[in-house]
């Protein structure tokens, strides 16, 4: 009995103990902060500006509400606790698609018709910012002007109908070397995103004066490369499970390993008037221990350290990511910027 | 002379196991990067594609080349050892200026005149996105059209101008409340900026059809925070000195503190022809030994060691600062795919 | 409304230039999207596309025709014109000059190669 | 250049009627094909563009349809003011060129 509370002492101890240690982390991070902060906007001291003048200064007008207004929704780090940003997968820029074959598209004798793209689920779940077909149109002995027509298969309607027009261009072409061309398809890739089966494919024309086609549709003798494709380009922010990431703790917990524990930096706590937005700020902080292949930074760092003839110090519990925030404040210049401050927010704790 | 044998022996053994210590390094960084490429890529295998498939199916298109050829000039960390991008420092995005006096815009009594702005050397050395000034107008009581005329103020001409104009508009207003009106100044801005002298002010005009000003150049009883104001957005990318940073090193080197080593990844000396580029880069480690106050990642880390119970095992030497790496790659599905790896270059090694 | 009037001589000698003009009325020409068309039709025939004019001076021409037709804007009249040069007996027609459409969207461009308004004719007879 | 035919060169109906005109381009243009109307005296109005959209102002009882190079205008139902001659003409290349007409009449 008299062990069971011994032990139990030494466990209070051991989590007072920490308490302690987090109670110095979280004084000395805040502290940190404020010097962070005057630092990175390279002011020597707080500017000396009152609440009343800043009423005064402060212009009532729409670029000012809209910038004011984003903190007005905080950012809260746990709205959805199970996907966040994936800062470790590729994000794909550009994709560049080459054509394949389809039943769709099949000339009178069989043979396929240019062109059909398929899209991969990397396209299918990405914003698409631009899409162009390019097609490359061989070189011309006269000057003459070619007109494009980018046309989109669709089911035969009761009038016949098989076509629909993407887009059109008008281009002069002199003698000497073909030339590639680019066409804006973001609206049709869209929707074939969004309907898949509407996707039949689409015919190129691009006739001269005297009705011949310079689209390199399907490469001749000495055409490789000169194929269509379609340049997707697209913004890629993908998601990927908190699981994969650092542990998160509260102020309660009695987690011992290397944890992120929540701190809210409050402006107008100090008397930082000057901070018009946001008021406060979540920057939380990292503590705890570091065991040697817990939670590292980077996937290899587990082998680095098998390795390591002097790395008997381990890893330590460190901010493996951090973001920025978006400050609105004076600048004692009767001045207000709004700009962004590098790493003020621990988004994630690990050992490296 | 039999000890200085010994102590030499012993610096030679520490060096030694420094050298392996850093080989063994450097070969896990190389595994570790094959494993975190095709990891980052959600590649299971590398893909299966020949040198000829590639000739064959590689368009020989602009897009294409302009992504080939941002690899022909290797990007080379040292190419400029003194200046770096800032990551630190604030990056300022809007700058809102109020007008200021100034001795050229009096009226005949010698009161002063709107508006001169002064703008800080934060403008001066960022590049202008945009600049809008806003003016408020007072609400009007029937419907009016409205001429807006933005003159900027010129030394006096000898057929005795002044003035020259900025902008100019016609507005329908509606009666009700006052509204915010933003006009294009941008390149009277940038102008000034490369010629301060000829910053002698700009003057406003909002004339009703009676010939009434409705533009608050000063604001009267009510008016505060309707005063005309700048917004000007910039593109801030400062620079700072290396000297901030952490240690470099060569292999050479017998330096034993936390320092970055460089490292090369040749992906077509481990037959990887699928990377259509780059063929190889300067991907570095980090290597070394920490004291508590050295080279630490965060200036406040130090605060937090100070005051650490349980920090024995103190910082240690991990990247502070990562860069991606832009890659050109077939995916093996006839598509190449231009895209951001995320840390795939330590830039930097800090104790953290 | 935008109406085009013909106007010139409605009798030519072979060899000679025939030159006719276009007045746009009911709009300014040169703050519109058009481009300015000309079309003849030889008597009994149908209709043949002689070429069109943009406000930047930039033409198109039939084939043709193109060695022996010039066409002008001049916006200070609302105008544009057409000159043909070395005329013969084959040139005698109506002529009509025409407002391209102007292009339901910035897609489908080549749509401004068809004549939404059109005058009501001119005839040229190229006789000795 | 691309020839435009027209078939029939002329077809008589009677008011109330459906008329089914025909256009063939020697090769593919795409939908870059218009029809036009010509009354006796008068310019030419423009019907149809783009195959099946219809100008302004004209009854809808005028429609296009087709692509490649087949095409066809119909009217649904002939009012005394439709008896005229019909044009077609394709832009798929730049040597704009007309069909060379059929003449709608009353039977």
């Known amino acids: 009995n008299e062990g069971s509370e011994r032990e139990e002492n030494v466990e209070k101890e051991g989590l007072c103990n920490a308490c302690a240690w987090r109670q110095n982390t979280r004084y000395s991070r805040i502290e940190a902060i404020k010097i962070q902060i005057l630092s990175k906007l390279r002011l020597e001291t707080a500017p000396n500006i009152s609440k009343d003048a800043i009423r005064q200064l402060l212009p009532r007008a729409p670029p000012l509400r809209e910038l004011i207004d984003q903190y007005d929704v905080q950012r809260d780090d746990s709205s959805d606790g199970s996907l966040e940003d994936d800062d470790y997968h590729a994000t794909t820029e550009t994709i560049i698609t080459m054509p394949t074959e389809s039943d769709f598209l099949m000339q009178a004798d069989g043979k396929p018709k240019c062109c059909f793209f398929k899209f991969s689920s990397k396209i299918q779940y990405n914003k698409v910012v631009k899409a162009q077909l390019w097609i490359y149109l061989r070189p011309v002995k006269t000057p003459t002007t070619v007109f494009v027509q980018i046309l989109r298969l669709i089911k035969p309607m009761k009038d016949g109908t098989r076509y629909t027009g993407i887009r059109s261009l008008k281009l002069d072409m002199s003698p000497g070397t073909g030339i590639w061309q680019s066409i804006d398809v973001k609206t049709v890739l869209q929707n074939w995103l969004k309907q898949p089966e509407s996707n039949l494919g689409i015919e190129i024309k691009a006739l001269d004066e005297n009705g011949h086609d310079l689209a390199v549709t399907f490469p001749g003798p000495g055409e490789d490369g000169l194929n269509p494709f379609l340049e997707v380009k697209v913004t890629d922010t993908p998601k990927r499970s908190r699981r994969d990431f650092g542990l998160d703790c509260d102020e309660h917990s009695t987690e011992s390993r290397c944890c992120r524990y929540p701190l809210t930096v409050d402006f107008e706590a100090f008397g930082w008037d000057w901070i018009i937005a946001p008021k406060r700020y979540k920057a939380n902080y990292c503590s705890g221990e570091c065991e040697f292949v817990f939670l590292q930074k980077y996937p290899h760092t587990h082998l680095v350290h098998q390795a390591n003839p002097r790395g008997s110090a381990g890893p330590c519990c460190t901010p493996t990511k951090m973001s920025p925030i978006n400050m609105l404040y004076f600048n004692g210049k009767e001045q207000i910027i709004y700009g962004k401050i590098p790493a003020m927010v621990v988004d994630r704790c690990g050992c490296s | 002379n039999e000890g200085s044998e010994r102590e030499e022996n012993v610096e030679k053994e520490g060096l030694c196991n420094a050298c392996a210590w850093r080989q063994n390094t450097r070969y896990s960084r190389i595994e570790a990067i094959k494993i975190q490429i095709l990891s980052k890529l959600r590649l299971e295998t590398a893909p299966n594609i020949s040198k000829d498939a590639i000739r064959q199916l590689l368009p020989r298109a602009p897009p294409l080349r302009e992504l080939i050829d941002q690899y022909d000039v290797q990007r080379d960390d040292s190419s400029d050892g003194s200046l770096e991008d800032d990551d630190y420092h604030a990056t300022t995005e809007t700058i809102i200026t109020m007008p200021t006096e100034s001795d050229f815009l009096m009226q005949a009594d010698g009161k002063p005149k709107c508006c001169f702005f002064k703008f800080s050397s934060k403008i001066q050395y960022n590049k202008v996105v945009k600049a809008q000034l806003w003016i408020y107008l007072r609400p009007v009581k029937t419907p009016t059209t409205v001429f807006v005329q933005i003159l900027r103020l010129i030394k006096p001409m000898k057929d005795g101008t002044r003035y020259t104009g900025i902008r100019s508009l016609k507005l329908d207003m509606s009666p009700g409340t006052g509204i915010w009106q933003s006009i294009d100044v941008k390149t009277v801005l940038q102008n000034w900026l490369k010629q301060p002298e000829s910053n002698l002010g700009i003057e406003i005009k909002a004339l009703d059809e009676n010939g009434h000003d409705l533009a608050v150049t000063f604001p009267g009883p009510g008016e505060d925070g309707l005063n005309p104001f700048l917004e000007v957005k910039v593109t801030d990318t400062p620079k700072r000195s290396r000297r901030d940073f952490g240690l470099d090193c060569d292999e050479h080197s017998t330096e034993s503190r936390c320092c970055r080593y460089p490292l090369t990844v040749d992906f077509e000396a481990f037959g990887w022809d699928w990377i259509i580029a780059p063929k190889r880069y300067k991907a570095n480690y980090c290597s070394g030994e920490c004291e508590f106050v050295f080279l630490q990642k965060y200036p406040h880390t130090h605060l937090v060691h100070q005051a650490n119970p349980r920090g024995s095992a103190g910082p240690c030497c991990t990247p502070t600062k990562m860069s991606p790496i832009n890659m050109l790659y077939f995916n093996g599905k006839e598509q190449i795919i231009y895209g951001k790896i995320p840390a795939m270059v330590v830039d930097r090694c800090g104790c953290s | 409304q935008v109406q085009l009037q013909e106007s010139g001589p409605g009798l030519v000698k072979p060899s000679q230039t025939l030159s006719l003009t276009c007045t746009v009325s009911g709009g300014s020409i040169s703050s519109s999207p058009y481009s300015w068309s000309w079309i003849r039709q030889p008597p009994g025939k149908g209709l043949e596309w002689i070429g069109y004019v943009d406000l930047a001076g930039s033409t198109d021409y039939n084939p043709s025709l193109k060695s022996r037709v010039t066409m002008s804007v001049d916006t200070s009249k609302n105008q544009f014109s057409l000159k043909v040069n070395s005329v013969t007996a084959a040139d005698t027609a109506v002529y009509y000059c025409a407002r391209a459409l102007s292009s339901r969207s910035s897609e489908w461009l080549l749509d401004q190669y068809t004549m939404d308004v059109w005058g009501q004719g001119t005839t040229v007879t190229v006789s000795s | 250049e691309i020839v435009m035919t027209q078939s029939p060169a002329t077809l008589s109906l009677s008011p109330g009627e459906r008329a089914t005109l025909s256009c063939r381009a020697s090769?593919?243009?795409?939908?870059?094909l218009a029809w036009y109307q010509q009354k006796p005296g008068q310019a030419p109005r423009l019907l149809i563009y783009?195959?099946?959209n219809r100008a302004t102002g004209i009854p809808a009882r005028f429609s296009g349809s087709g692509s490649g190079t087949d095409f066809t205008l119909t009217i649904s139902s002939l009012e005394p003011e439709d008896f005229a001659v019909y044009y077609c003409q394709q832009y798929g290349t730049a040597r704009l060129t007309f069909g060379g007409g059929t003449k709608v009449e009353i039977k």
């Open positions: 090769q593919s243009i795409g939908i870059n």
């Open positions: 783009g195959v099946s």
